[in-house]
């Protein structure tokens, strides 16, 4: 759990409360609102950080065209009950004992219901597409240029593995990324595509998780990369259960 | 060497508030890598964890579920010292209450308060 | 909340033995596991933290290792001074819980 040594603080998540406890006097850190310990040489989970993020005071479409089963985030914020690893239980409620199950993302994907609904397993999201539209520039940013960029962004910031990336693609002014993660490709260590597309969510919109670093500075050949739109789409390994109410709505 | 030493009454009454404090010598309450803790045994309950409070930039505290809505626990950066306020107390209360420092281990605390809770 | 169950809850154990004791977690808590001593009328006293890391001026006959759910405190040959009450704790989460306690005694 190697975090800065000097100051004892959590690179990888600034939502966090470290102490130098560790073995050697080695840093060691708790997400805030879980009181979970984090692992800081890796994004921390979504569920941790929407967790961590609810109990701070509070201050201040298409290229590819999303499946018919494509879930949008479209709840908000809530308070999330994570499992001992820090997962997203299946089944979430609210304080006044309404219910609904969510994907690996957090993301609902049934009818809301009362204390009796069940959610039996938690859902893998394995396909992830973030639809992006830029600021205009002089002229199109150079596909493949724009395409190493973003999967260097992925590999180096969010320590997403690149065989996760699946495609860029580019249509002035639309940029879309597919992030793909089966349960069977997934292996220990690997970072999830859930937890990385949050991270890279929070950086489009200036409230990075990173600690002490930077605002998210995207550049194409030196050339400003500037997001004025985002879109995220959520495809589960097994599809989405809504009443035909919700879906003609 | 950090010592941790509790003052407080040892018989509090039914409904009233139970109040104790630790003091720091070795170390600051308001160190930036310290955390400072409450924590009471009982034959029936055994060691239980009440809470904490600690210092980054801002204070934080965190409390257990089952006392949630009785405790706070309070740093004084004036006299180098924490508090924990239990309010109101039942019976149940009745235990042996240490302070103590650290997170993820515990490796200096205070000597003990038994409190009787009691009319 | 997690819980912990230490076995046994009491040993009878001669000077010179070697004694183990185990501590079972309700949830996997990775290394984040302490252990302590506490003797009648005493403060407990930090004793293995990080599941296996020997806190500073404490014998060496005591070890601790395990991970995941189950872990093991070990003193390898037991002095007249170790009979006492041992606790083990998770740390990896709020709230921190403590085990039953295994009262180690004379036999």
């Known amino acids: 759990h190697t975090a800065a040594q000097d100051n004892c603080t959590c690179p990888t998540n600034k939502m966090t409360v470290c102490s130098p406890d560790g073995p050697g006097g080695r840093c060691q850190c708790r997400a805030l609102g879980s009181g979970m310990a984090v692992d800081c040489s890796t994004l921390t989970s979504k569920c941790l950080l929407l967790k961590a993020r609810m109990s701070a005071p509070k201050n201040a479409r298409t290229l590819v065209r999303p499946s018919e089963h494509a879930l949008v985030d479209n709840d908000g914020l809530y308070d999330p009950d994570c499992d001992p690893e820090g997962r997203f239980k299946a089944r979430q409620c609210n304080q006044t004992s309404v219910c609904w199950c969510v994907n690996s993302v957090g993301v609902r994907r049934t009818d809301k219901g009362d204390l009796s609904l069940r959610c039996d397993e938690l859902v893998r999201t394995h396909h992830i597409l973030i639809d992006l539209r830029h600021r205009p520039t002089a002229g199109a940013f150079n596909h493949s240029d724009l395409d190493a960029e973003l999967r260097r962004l992925f590999r180096e910031r969010y320590r997403l593995h690149p065989k996760f990336v699946a495609a860029v693609h580019y249509e002035q002014p639309t940029i879309q990324i597919e992030l793909r993660q089966n349960t069977s490709q997934k292996a220990a260590g690997d970072v999830d595509i859930g937890d990385a597309a949050y991270y890279f969510e929070r950086d489009i919109k200036g409230e990075s998780l990173f600690q002490g670093r930077g605002g998210l500075d995207l550049r194409v050949r030196g050339e400003p990369l500037q997001v004025e739109r985002t879109l995220i789409y959520y495809l589960d390994e097994i599809p989405p259960k809504f009443s035909m109410k919700r879906l003609t709505a | 060497q950090v010592q941790l030493q509790q003052s407080g009454p040892g018989l509090v009454k039914p409904s009233q508030t139970l109040s104790l404090t630790c003091a720091i010598s070795?170390?600051?309450?308001?160190?930036?890598?310290?955390?400072w803790n409450w924590i009471r045994q009982s034959p029936s309950r055994g060691l239980e964890w009440l809470g904490r409070?600690?210092?980054?930039?801002?204070?934080?505290?965190d409390y257990a579920v089952s006392v949630k809505s009785r405790i706070t626990i309070t740093p004084d950066t004036s006299k180098n010292q924490f508090s924990l306020r239990l309010n109101p107390v039942t019976p149940e209360d009745t235990a042996v209450y240490y302070c103590?420092?650290?997170?993820?281990?515990?490796?200096?605390w205070g000597q003990g308060t038994l409190v009787t809770v009691s009319s | 909340d997690i819980q912990l169950t230490q076995s046994p809850s009491f040993l009878s154990a001669s000077v010179g033995d070697r004694v183990t004791i185990t501590c079972r977690a309700s949830q996997g808590i990775s290394s984040y596991l302490a252990w302590y001593q506490q003797k009648p009328g005493k403060a407990p006293k930090l004793l293995i933290y990080a599941a296996s890391t020997l806190q500073s001026g404490v014998p060496s006959r005591f070890s601790g290792s395990g991970s995941g759910t189950e872990f093991t405190l070990t003193i390898s040959s037991l002095q007249p001074e170790d009979f006492a009450t041992y606790y083990c704790?998770?740390?990896?989460?709020?709230?921190?819980?403590f085990g039953g306690g295994t009262k180690v005694e004379i036999k």
């Open positions: 704790q998770q740390v990896k989460i709020y709230p921190l819980t």
């Open positions: 409070t600690c210092y980054r930039s801002k204070w934080y505290n």
């Open positions: 103590a420092r650290g997170d993820f281990r515990f490796d200096s």
């Open positions: 070795g170390d600051s309450v308001s160190s930036t890598s310290a955390v």
